[in-house]
Interface confidence: low
C-alpha cells in the first residue's frame, strides 16, 4: 500500500541525511512536508529566545527554498501540535506520519501523543534517528540497560559499535515526482510565517544565518582547508578570534540544518590522508563524541536537566540571588571580559567555547556561587546552538557537579582573558565604552588612576560597574564550598569521574610515524591517546 | 478569467518620475505575490522585484539595477498593482508588464499571467 | 546573481520538424526553471515551470527537461503559431534572471 504521508520536520531542518523524509518518499503517493510551529511548546518546552526565534524561521525559509527546488513545498502550520497533527491527518486522509526521532523528553512525550492519535485515527508513525551519530538505545543496551557516565566507558562501547551508520543519500526531484504534490494552494496558505508576524523583536547583528544551505556553505568552506581541519584542536582556539576559529558550525547540528554523520564521515576522509592530525578528543570527530557522549547519558539520567533529583549530579546549596544573576546576565559584572563575552552572546547568539568556560564558572563555582541551573536556562535562550543535553551536560561539567574532576582550577576573569588576548581587541569590540583604555588596564579598568579614567573618557562605578566581588576572596570561599559538597557526597562524585583529561585540557598529540592514517573509527584512535 | 491590464506609461525627461498601475482581476489579489518585469526594445526580460502576498505581509525584493529608485505598492482594496519610478534614466526605456507568480500548482511560483504592457520613454 | 544563458539567439525550423531550446544557468537552479513564449508585438505567456510542468492550456508538443544546470525546451510537431521569441527563467534565488531568448524561425 502506498501512503499518504505527513512528514514532520522537527529537528531534522535539512534534506541531506533525511532518513525518515527519505522513508516518507520511498513508501508514499503523496508526502506533505510539515513544520508545526507550536509557540506555546516552543516557549515554555524549547525556550527559545529572539535570535534563535529569527535562526529557526531563516531555516524554515531555507527548507521552503530548497523543497521548492525539487518540486514540493514547505507547509508551516501554527497551532497546538496535536491538534494541528489531528486535523490535517483528517484533512488530508493520512495514513502515516513520518519524523526524526529525538531524545529531549519534551519530543519523547510529543512523538507519544502523536503514536497515541494514531492508534485513534489509524495512521502508522515512523520515527527515525538522524541528530546523533549512534542509536543511543543500543549503546545504551550494550553497558547493561545504563548509559556510560564516563567519557572513556563511552568510548569502550562505541568500539564495539564500529562505525556509525552511514548518511543516507539526498532526495531528489525524481523521489519528489514519484509522489503527487500537496494540493493547489496550500503552500501559500502556510507560508513560513516572517518574524513581525510572530512579534519577535527585529534581528540584532547576528552574524549567524539559518538553514541548510548557509550551513553546507560554511561546512565546504571550512573542510576546503584540509590542513586546518586535521590540526583543529580545542585549547589552542582563542575566544577573541571575532571570525571563530572553532567550525562555526554548531548552530546548525542543533537545528539539524546540518547532518551530523555527514560531517563525521567528511572528517573521516581527511583525517585518512592527513600525514599529522589531532586525536580525539581534542580533534573535530573527537568533539563530536563529546556530543554523542552527553546525548547517550542525558537520554536515559532522569532530571538531567536539574539538580534535583539527578543522580550524577552534586547536590549543591547555591546562593539564590536574583540581583547577582541579573548582572551576570546584562553584563553588568564589572569584569570586561565576562562582560563582552556576555555582550557578545546576547548580540550575537554565539559566544567561543573558551568564552563559555569562563562566563559559566565565573556564574557558579568560582565567583557568584548561582546555580549551573539558572546560566543553562540563560544559555538555552540566547544560544543559538542551544542543545538540551550538551547545554546541561556542559553547565554540570563546568560548576564541577558532575563529570569534572579539576575542580581546584578557576578561571581568573582578568588573567585568562589577558592572556589569550593581551591587547583587549574582544573587549574594545563589545564594550566599547572602554575602547580607549590602554591594554594595561583594558581588563581591570577599576585599577587605573581617575585621571586615566577620565581621559579613557569613562568613570568606573558611573560609566561602568565596579566589580561585583573580589574574585581572589569569592573564588577562595566557593572553592572550600565545593571541596565540602564533594566530601559530604563523594559516591556521586566518583560516579563521573574520569581519569581522561577533559578536551580543555588535553595536550596537543600527534601522530609522527609514517603510517599512514587509516579510517579507523574515532573511539579506536581515542584508546591510543 | 485572470485578468492584468498595466497604465500610466508614456514619455518621461530624464531624472524624471512616472507611477504605472496594473489593474487586476479574476482572482483573489490579496492570496498573490504580484512582479514588475520590463523588456527594452528588440532585448530581453528583466525581472524588476515584486510585492508578497498578505501571508507575508507584502514585503518586496528587487534587483540591484533599481533597487532604491523603484517602489513596488499595491492596493489591495482595490486589487491594483503599482510600481513608483524615481530618478528615471534612458535605460529604463522599455515595456514595462505586470506579472502574477503562481502559487505553488499553478505556475509553480512562475510568473503565470501577464499584462499586454506599457511603454515608457526617457527621454529629453 | 546567476546567469542564464541562451546560446542560440536565432533558431530555424521547419513545419512539423521538432526542434530543442537549449538553457544553461550558471549556477545550481535544481528544478525552479520555467519557459516563456513571446509572440511579435505581445506579452509573454508560461508555456513551463518546474523545469518539466506544462502550464494549464499549453499543447502537449512543449516539453521541458533538465535539473540544476541545464535545460531544455523541446517543440516536436512544430506549427507555424510558434514562431515567437522563447525565454527561460530561474526562479530558484533573487533577483530571478531570464535568458537573453531564442527567436524561432519558421523555415
Known amino acids: 500500500m502506498r501512503h499518504r504521508t505527513i512528514h514532520l520536520f522537527r529537528k531534522g531542518l535539512r534534506l541531506h541525511d533525511n532518513p525518515a523524509l527519505l522513508a516518507a518518499l520511498q513508501s508514499s503517493e503523496v508526502v506533505y512536508p510539515v513544520y508545526i510551529l507550536d509557540r506555546a511548546f516552543m516557549t515554555s518546552s524549547m525556550h527559545i529566545g529572539a535570535l534563535r526565534w529569527h535562526f529557526l524561521l531563516q531555516s524554515l525559509e531555507d527548507l521552503r527554498s530548497s523543497l521548492r527546488q525539487l518540486g514540493s513545498c514547505l507547509l508551516v502550520i501554527q497551532g497546538e501540535y496535536e491538534s494541528v497533527v489531528r486535523d490535517h491527518v483528517q484533512k488530508w486522509n493520512i495514513t502515516q506520519v513520518t519524523l526524526d526521532a529525538e531524545m529531549e523528553p519534551f519530543y519523547k512525550e510529543m512523538e507519544a501523543n502523536i503514536r497515541g492519535l494514531g492508534e485513534e485515527l489509524g495512521f502508522q508513525v515512523l520515527s527515525l534517528m538522524g541528530h546523533s551519530l549512534y542509536n543511543t538505545q543500543r549503546i545504551l543496551e550494550l553497558n547493561g540497560g545504563t548509559p556510560p557516565l564516563t567519557y572513556k566507558r563511552f568510548l569502550r562501547i562505541l568500539s564495539l559499535l564500529g562505525d556509525p551508520e552511514v548518511p543516507v543519500r539526498n532526495p531528489t526531484a525524481e523521489d519528489f515526482q514519484r509522489c503527487s504534490p500537496p494540493e493547489l494552494g496550500l503552500a501559500e496558505c502556510y507560508g513560513v510565517p516572517l518574524p513581525t508576524d510572530l512579534k519577535i523583536p527585529p534581528e540584532s547583528i547576528s552574524p549567524w544565518r539559518g538553514g541548510e544551505s548557509e550551513g553546507l556553505q560554511r561546512l565546504e568552506q571550512h573542510l576546503a582547508d584540509q590542513g586546518w581541519v586535521a590540526s583543529f584542536t580545542k585549547p589552542k582556539t582563542v575566544p577573541n578570534s571575532l571570525l571563530p576559529s572553532t567550525t562555526g558550525l554548531s548552530p546548525y547540528f542543533s537545528t539539524g540544518c546540518l547532518s551530523v554523520r555527514s560531517f563525521f564521515y567528511r572528517l573521516s576522509n581527511i583525517y585518512a590522508q592527513a600525514k599529522h592530525h589531532s586525536l580525539p578528543p581534542v580533534s573535530l570527530q573527537g568533539q563530536l563524541l563529546w556530543r554523542e557522549f552527553f546525548y547517550t547519558v542525558a537520554s536515559a539520567t532522569p532530571n538531567f536537566t536539574k539538580m534535583a533529583g539527578n543522580p550524577i549530579c552534586l547536590q549543591i546549596r547555591w546562593y539564590e540571588d536574583a540581583e547577582r544573576l541579573h548582572k551576570w546576565k546584562t553584563a553588568q559584572t564589572g569584569f570586561p571580559w565576562i562582560d563582552a563575552i556576555m555582550t557578545q552572546l546576547r548580540q550575537e547568539g554565539w559566544i567561543h567555547h573558551l568564552a563559555r568556560h569562563a562566563a559559566a564558572c565565573f556564574l557558579t563555582r568560582g565567583d557568584l556561587w548561582i546555580s549551573w541551573e539558572e546560566g543553562m536556562k540563560v544559555f538555552e535562550e540566547l544560544l543559538l546552538d542551544a542543545d538540551y543535553s550538551i547545554n546541561a551536560g556542559n553547565w554540570m561539567w563546568l560548576s564541577a557537579s558532575a563529570f569534572f574532576h579539576h575542580y581546584t582550577r578557576i578561571f581568573c576573569p582578568v588573567r585568562f582573558g589577558r592572556r589569550t588576548d593581551p591587547e583587549g581587541q574582544y573587549i574594545r569590540k563589545y564594550l566599547p565604552i572602554l575602547k580607549n583604555f590602554p591594554s594595561k588596564y583594558i581588563y581591570e579598568p577599576w585599577t587605573a588612576s581617575e585621571e586615566e579614567q577620565k581621559q579613557a573618557g569613562c568613570i568606573i562605578g558611573r560609566d561602568y560597574p565596579f566589580p561585583m566581588v573580589d574574585h581572589k576572596e569569592a573564588s577562595d570561599h566557593n572553592l572550600q564550598l565545593m571541596k565540602q559538597a564533594r566530601e559530604e557526597q563523594h559516591r556521586i562524585a566518583q560516579l563521573t569521574r574520569d581519569d581522561a583529561d577533559d578536551p580543555m585540557e588535553m595536550k596537543l598529540k600527534r601522530d609522527h610515524s609514517e603510517e599512514s592514517f587509516t579510517k579507523t573509527k574515532a573511539a579506536r584512535m581515542t584508546e591510543q591517546t | 478569467e485572470v485578468k492584468l491590464e498595466e497604465s500610466g506609461g508614456g514619455l518621461v525627461q530624464p531624472g524624471g518620475s512616472l507611477r504605472l498601475s496594473c489593474a487586476t482581476s479574476?482572482?483573489?489579489?490579496?492570496?498573490?505575490?504580484m512582479s514588475w518585469v520590463r523588456q527594452p526594445p528588440g532585448k530581453a526580460l528583466e525581472w524588476l522585484g515584486f510585492?508578497?502576498?498578505?501571508?507575508?505581509?507584502?514585503?518586496?525584493e528587487y534587483s540591484a539595477s533599481v533597487k532604491g529608485r523603484f517602489t513596488i505598492s499595491r492596493d489591495n482594496s482595490q486589487s491594483i498593482l503599482y510600481l513608483q519610478m524615481n530618478t528615471l534614466r534612458a535605460e529604463d526605456s522599455a515595456t514595462y508588464y505586470c506579472?502574477?507568480?503562481?502559487?505553488?500548482?499553478?505556475?509553480?511560483?512562475?510568473?503565470?499571467?501577464w499584462g499586454q504592457g506599457t511603454s515608457v520613454t526617457v527621454s529629453s | 546573481d546567476i546567469v542564464m544563458t541562451q546560446s542560440h539567439k536565432f533558431m530555424s525550423t521547419s513545419v512539423g520538424d521538432r526542434v530543442s531550446i537549449t538553457c544553461k544557468a550558471s549556477?545550481?537552479?535544481?528544478?525552479?526553471v520555467a519557459w516563456y513564449q513571446q509572440k511579435p508585438g505581445q506579452s509573454p505567456k508560461l508555456l513551463i515551470y518546474?523545469?518539466?510542468t506544462r502550464h494549464t492550456g499549453v499543447p502537449d508538443r512543449f516539453t521541458g527537461s533538465g535539473s540544476g544546470t541545464d535545460f531544455t525546451l523541446t517543440i516536436s510537431n512544430v506549427q507555424s503559431e510558434d514562431l515567437a521569441d522563447y525565454f527561460c527563467?530561474?526562479?530558484?534565488?533573487?533577483?530571478?534572471?531570464f535568458g537573453g531568448g531564442t527567436k524561432l524561425e519558421i523555415k
Open positions: 506579472a502574477r507568480d503562481g502559487g505553488y500548482d499553478d505556475g509553480g511560483y512562475a510568473m503565470d499571467y
Open positions: 479574476g482572482f483573489t489579489f490579496t492570496d498573490y505575490y
Open positions: 510585492i508578497r502576498n498578505k501571508a507575508n505581509v507584502y514585503t518586496t
Open positions: 549556477q545550481d537552479v535544481g528544478t525552479a
Open positions: 518546474w523545469a518539466s
Open positions: 527563467q530561474q526562479y530558484s534565488s533573487y533577483p530571478y534572471t
